[in-house]
Interface confidence: low
Amino acid sequence: ASTQSPSVFPLTRCCKNIPSNATSVTLGCLATGYFPEPVMVTWDTGSLNGTTMTLPATTLTLSGHYATISLLTVSGAWAKQMFTCRVAHTPSSTDWVDNKTFSVCSRDFTPPTVKILQSSCDGGGHFPPTIQLLCLVSGYTPGTINITWLEDGQVMDVDLSTASTTQEGELASTQSELTLSQKHWLSDRTYTCQVTYQGHTFEDSTKKCADSNPRGVSAYLSRPSPFDLFIRKSPTITCLVVDLAPSKGTVNLTWSRASGKPVNHSTRKEEKQRNGTLTVTSTLPVGTRDWIEGETYQCRVTHPHLPRALMRSTTKTSGPRAAPEVYAFATPEWPGSRDKRTLACLIQNFMPEDISVQWLHNEVQLPDARHSTTQPRKTKGSGFFVFSRLEVTRAEWEQKDEFICRAVHEAASPSQTVQRAVSVNPGLAGGSAQSQRAPDRVLCHSGQQQGLPRAAGGSVPHPRCHCGAGRADWPGPPELDVCVEEAEGEAPWTWTGLC
């Protein structure tokens, strides 16, 4: 075998598994995949004492390469200290060395969302003598965070003793307030709230910005539903314009494609709302292959009373893909409701968030109005989840006691569907699962409502739930309520239909 340098991995326990009164704790360093012997493992413990033990090298059967583990035991009081394991492999090179610096234990964590909110001006657009900026640090696994305010990148001398932290369920939120004089605010400086947490830095910035968006008029553009895309194979996208003032001028909605290719014929609908405003929708059929291959579609909204055109565009969601897991449950009989039962379907850990949910009985799809399905919410992992609820009658389950919950999602294989059968009386009829694999872990859910408008909300964990790995990003759905100057013209959005 040829010379191969080792891969080095820190070995730590989960912090929650180490008793607070532990007298000693052990951490390790794994050097693996090297050839030939030997490796030299040393520990840098700073000024702290510890005992080390390096285990004899073992041979990796398939490759003939070697692996070894070195263990360091230190006092339990030092559990929060950092230690460095230094691995040298002179056969690779006389100066080959790999350092790993880590603490005794590691935590799964959900990083924070950082957002600055600012006090509003009065109705006439005039700023008060002082302006308050509020830094919201939300949705993170409880732990030490440091908040710093910056003015044009320079650290400000701010009293942070007013920062307050609250905990809701498994996640924490902190807020810090900064008060500025009107003079400072109007000077066009940038203010940044910088948060340091678990070795990473997260921040948000704000500055006074011009009010350049046409007030009151909003446009949204939907993506095709997975059901229309993969099952019906006739996907459509819809451009929705709301809060238009009825007037003599005509609202024009024009469709185009980024590729420059022609678009299909669209259908248009106008609706007068109770509050006197006008809502206009235009629905455009799109090619299944065009959409899947990443074509971008644009909707342009013009009106004589708009200072400028509104442009919205949509395309297939990018990023990692993960197929949904589907679990279906029947609720037990409830006193006084012997002739009705509720079925529930949990669909989780899918990416991206676009999903269609259907219920079937007797091989026939039930109307969408029969079931109620939540908008996708982020899990504590990197995917999304939804719940769907179906009420069934005794007549239905006595005719055939098998109901199927089906999820349509682009990552599901082989046919973009995953389904699970459920029976009201499971002892009498067994439900079978198709395209269903047991999950590696079940995640405990909490999060915020995805869609419009944004709403707070938690969710009930699965009864057998245990917490899996934490998210390595900041959760949260898009919001429309932004300063267009900051968002560079086109605010992102997600359309979930009229409320």
């Epitope: 997260f202 921040e203 910035s205 919001e479």
Partner: nanobody, 116 residues
């Protein structure tokens, strides 16, 4: 239309180097924190490196610290990931992610393969 486009991936030998680029369009780039993630086949997504918006503060995942460097050029709407001393376990699809407040965008990913 918001787009993130990664480039610079490819096949490289262990110990070699690659420089990934992520070009953004349709957003005010300087507002956004940039994160590189990677996902190896059959494994969960892993945070590689973060560079913040206003101050370009950087931080790294444990497995790449000391070998990878993240940077950004706001004038060119581009983020970079310089990857040195590459190892076979760095093989993955590398994704660029841009975040500002609750806005989040992903690139399509670029494949990096480290093999002799």
């Amino acid at each position: 239309d918001v787009q993130l486009q990664e480039s610079g991936g490819g096949l490289v030998q262990p110990g070699g180097s690659l420089r990934l680029s992520c070009v953004a369009s349709g957003i005010r780039f300087s507002n956004y924190g940039l994160t590189w993630y990677r996902q190896a086949p059959g494994k969960s997504r892993e945070l590689v490196a973060v560079i913040s918006s206003a101050t370009s503060t950087t931080s790294y995942g444990d497995s790449v610290r000391g070998r990878f460097t993240i940077s950004r050029d706001n004038a060119k709407n581009t983020a970079f990931l310089q990857m040195n001393s590459l190892k076979p376990e760095d093989t993955a699809v590398y994704y660029c992610n841009a975040r500002w407040r609750d806005y989040e965008y992903w690139g399509q990913g670029t494949q990096v393969t480290v093999s002799s």
